[in-house]
Every structure is written in structure tokens, then in C-alpha cells.
């Protein structure tokens, strides 16, 4: 906190310029008009102030705008954005994507800070949904952004925004998140032909139900093992050996290396050993010949 002192004669700032770096903190406080600072914030971003001097400038803006900064100031905060607390940011109303980009640029290369998380939250809530342009911007700066959202938050993503999602954006998503995103992706890509559709939908398949996997198995998609291992176990279990063979195509040989891992392990336990033997991979652990398999879930449904 800088104590209030009168501005020395001849030092009153007429504009925000380089000469201000020669002002002491108390002189900045006394000689720079807050309203002038607010209208010339863009100039602050070209002047090599010290961090201490920037603290004084922030203090002046805080006094001028106790209810929160207007967007005209926010857009030009530059480094000062990093000095804001989440509480400061919650007072803002940021509606312009350009403002969002400008502030994300300041934090570029760093982890998502509490300030950035609060800013994004305010921005998305202000827009009402996570539209394509916003999602494009956010995933460009933070590839893991989408997977940081709760399933409830993801439900506000319109299917049209799914076109902006890259495979790496989904790397850290868990099954609950993919359960929400998969139906949106299916809707977004529904007009694409078989092979193009599979390329686009592939990263979302961790949320796919059994019937969709069965349908894909009829389309010669040659799913790789990495994708197969990310499928929901409950979606894989009902697939027949023939369906898995068609789904994986030439990659079916990879099942041997994964036979002790989910979902392959659990799937093997559900298959007849006879059927597994047809693959010629030496997969073991299937239901021995002559055993009767009772589907208890079906029995419960009937009773």
C-alpha cells in the first residue's frame, strides 16, 4: 500500500508513456490519474515497468473499479491479469473471445492457474454453452481442457463443437466423460462415410455402447489395440469372437499380448474356448466345452 502524497509540481502524467518507469511508487500513486490509466491500458503493455510499479497501477484500477473492471480494461491487462485473484475475476463480465485469447496468451506455456480457470468459467457461463470457437481457443491453449470438465459441464457442449476436438484433447478423459461426449460425436459425424467416420469417432469410442461396436464390426474398420483397450468393459463383454475379429481385422493378433488386461481378460472369460481357439492365438481362459452358460441378468429381467 502506497501512502497518499501530493504529486510534485510538473510530474502529473499527461499520458501513459516510458517516462513513468522513472517514477517512484509514491509518484505513480500521486501523479497517474486512474481514469487516464484505464483508457491507456494498452500502453502499459509496451512499457517495462517493474513488478512493484505494476502493483501500484493495479491498486489504482482497483480503486477506480471496486465492482470489477470493464472489458475495455480487461482486454489490455497483460501481465496484470496474473496479479488478479480469482475473487477479482469473478466480478468481471467477459464476453469477447478476443479478450479471452489476449489473457490466455499472457499465461501461455504455464499450467492452468486458478485465475485462468476462473476466467474460463466466467466466460463459458456468460455464453451459456461451450461453442465451437471457444472450444477451439481453449483446447489450443490447454489440450487437456475438455477432460478437466465434469460430465455435467460437458453436457453443455453442443455437438457442432465436437469438430474442434483433436484426439490428444481426450487423452486424459475418463469413461464418465467419454460417455457424455460419445453421443455428441456420433451426432456430429453422422453424415460421414464409413472410413472417414471411423477416423473421427475413434478417439470417442471409450463411450460407445455394445450395439455401436457391433455395427462398427460390420464395416471393416480395423480398430487398433490401443483403441480397443480403452473401450468400456461392459460394452466389450457381449461381443462375440467373430465380432471382435471383424472389429480388429489384422490387429486381432494383438489380443494375445493383452490377454491379462481389461477388457480383454474379462471378455475372454465370457467366450467359449472353442470359439477362442478359432482365432489361433492361443488365448486361454474361455468357458470349457460342454458347459452351459446362464445369463443371470436375463433371468432377473424376466422374473
Amino acid at each position: 500500500e502506497v501512502e497518499k502524497t501530493a504529486c510534485p509540481s510538473g510530474k502529473k502524467a499527461r499520458e501513459i508513456d516510458e517516462s513513468l518507469i522513472f517514477y517512484k511508487k509514491w509518484e505513480l500513486e500521486a501523479c497517474v490519474d486512474a481514469a487516464l490509466l484505464a483508457t491507456q491500458m494498452d500502453r502499459v503493455n509496451a512499457i517495462p515497468f517493474t513488478y512493484e510499479q505494476l502493483d501500484v497501477l493495479k491498486h489504482k484500477l482497483d480503486e477506480l473499479y471496486p465492482q470489477g473492471y470493464p472489458e475495455s480494461v480487461i482486454q489490455h491487462l497483460g501481465y496484470l491479469f496474473l496479479k488478479m485473484s480469482p475473487e477479482d475475476i469473478r466480478k468481471w463480465n467477459v464476453t469477447s473471445l478476443e479478450t479471452l485469447k489476449a489473457l490466455l496468451e499472457v499465461n501461455k506455456g504455464h499450467e492452468m492457474s486458478p485465475q485462468v480457470a476462473t476466467l474460463i468459467d466466467r466466460f463459458v457461463k456468460g455464453r451459456g454453452q461451450l461453442d465451437k470457437d471457444t472450444l477451439d481457443t481453449l483446447t489450443a491453449f490447454y489440450p487437456g481442457y475438455l477432460c478437466s470438465l465434469s460430465p455435467e459441464e460437458l453436457s453443455s457442449v453442443p455437438p457442432s463443437s465436437i469438430w474442434a476436438v483433436r484426439p490428444q484433447d481426450l487423452d486424459t478423459c475418463d469413461p464418465r466423460q467419454l460417455d457424455v461426449l460419445y453421443p455428441k460425436a456420433r451426432l456430429a459425424f453422422q453424415n460421414m462415410n464409413g472410413s472417414e467416420y471411423f477416423v473421427k469417432i475413434q478417439s470417442f469410442l471409450g463411450g460407445a455402447p455394445t450395439e455401436d461396436l457391433k455395427a462398427l464390426s460390420q464395416q471393416n474398420v480395423s480398430m487398433d489395440l490401443a483403441t480397443f483397450m480403452k473401450l468400456r468393459t461392459d460394452a466389450v463383454l457381449p461381443l462375440t469372437v467373430a465380432e471382435v475379429q471383424k472389429l480388429l481385422g489384422p490387429h486381432v493378433e494383438g489380443l494375445k499380448a493383452e490377454e491379462r488386461h481389461r477388457p480383454v481378460r474379462d471378455w475372454i472369460l465370457r467366450q467359449r474356448q472353442d470359439d477362442l481357439d478359432t482365432l489361433g492365438l492361443g488365448l486361454q481362459g474361455g468357458i470349457p466345452n460342454g458347459y452351459l452358460v446362464l445369463d443371470l441378468s436375463m433371468q432377473e429381467a424376466l422374473s
Epitope: 512499457i47 517495462p48 501481465y79
Partner: nanobody, 115 residues
Framework: LQLVESGGGLVQPGGSLRLSCAAS????????IGWVRQAPGKEREGVSS????????NYADSVKGRFTVSRDNAKHTVYLQMNSLKPEDTAVYYC??????????MGQGTSVTVS
């Protein structure tokens, strides 16, 4: 973002020193740079500044005519040439930078003693 100052030392009154400011982990070329100093027990004060192109320079009244700020973007370095040094120039000298989107950087300082 970190800046690194060097070139400080002990010098007699009337002597000269040249301080350098370089970037660690990024390039200085599009950064405007300011030199500031802090004498023991005193507040930091601005000494000089130079624009990113090098076309514009500014000096505090106390160093005008004695100090010259320059930059060599090929070497990604900014210099502060200090001539006719006085005991009152004794301080830790820091460089502070501002780049695109208002990104900021500052160094740890280099000590200058005139005695």
C-alpha cells in the same frame, strides 16, 4: 520468464562498466527493456529504457549523458554502458522486460559498487 544480468563489479569513481541483460529460455528480441537499480535501503528507481526495435531510448535525469542503453538483437542481448560512475551509482542493477501480450520478465540483478 527469467532475465539474467551480468557485468557488475567494483569500480573506482570516474570508471566505466558495461552491464548485459540476456534471456533465459526465450528470446529478448520483441521485448522492450528497462534498467532499474536499487541502492541499499532505498526504493528501486528506473535508470533507462529501450524499445524492442532499439529505436527509442529514455534515461533518468540522474544518468543522462553518462549512461547509454543499446541492444544487439543478433546476440539477443541488451546493454547498459555506464561511464563517469559516481559513488551514488552504487546499487544492484536489474533489467525488466515486457513483450507481446504484456508478458513480463525480470532478472535477479547484478551488483555495482563505485568506491
Amino acid at each position: 520468464l527469467q532475465l539474467v544480468e551480468s557485468g557488475g563489479g567494483l569500480v573506482q569513481p570516474g570508471g566505466s562498466l558495461r552491464l548485459s541483460c540476456a534471456a533465459s529460455g526465450f528470446t529478448l528480441d520483441n521485448y522492450a527493456i528497462g534498467w532499474v537499480r536499487q541502492a541499499p535501503g532505498k526504493e528501486r528507481e528506473g535508470v533507462s529504457s529501450i524499445s524492442s526495435s532499439g529505436g527509442s531510448t529514455n534515461y533518468a535525469d540522474s544518468v543522462k549523458g553518462r549512461f547509454t542503453v543499446s541492444r544487439d538483437n543478433a546476440k539477443h542481448t541488451v546493454y547498459l554502458q555506464m561511464n563517469s560512475l559516481k559513488p551514488e551509482d552504487t546499487a544492484v542493477y536489474y533489467c525488466a522486460g515486457v513483450g507481446d501480450y504484456g508478458r513480463r520478465a525480470m532478472g535477479q540483478g547484478t551488483s555495482v559498487t563505485v568506491s
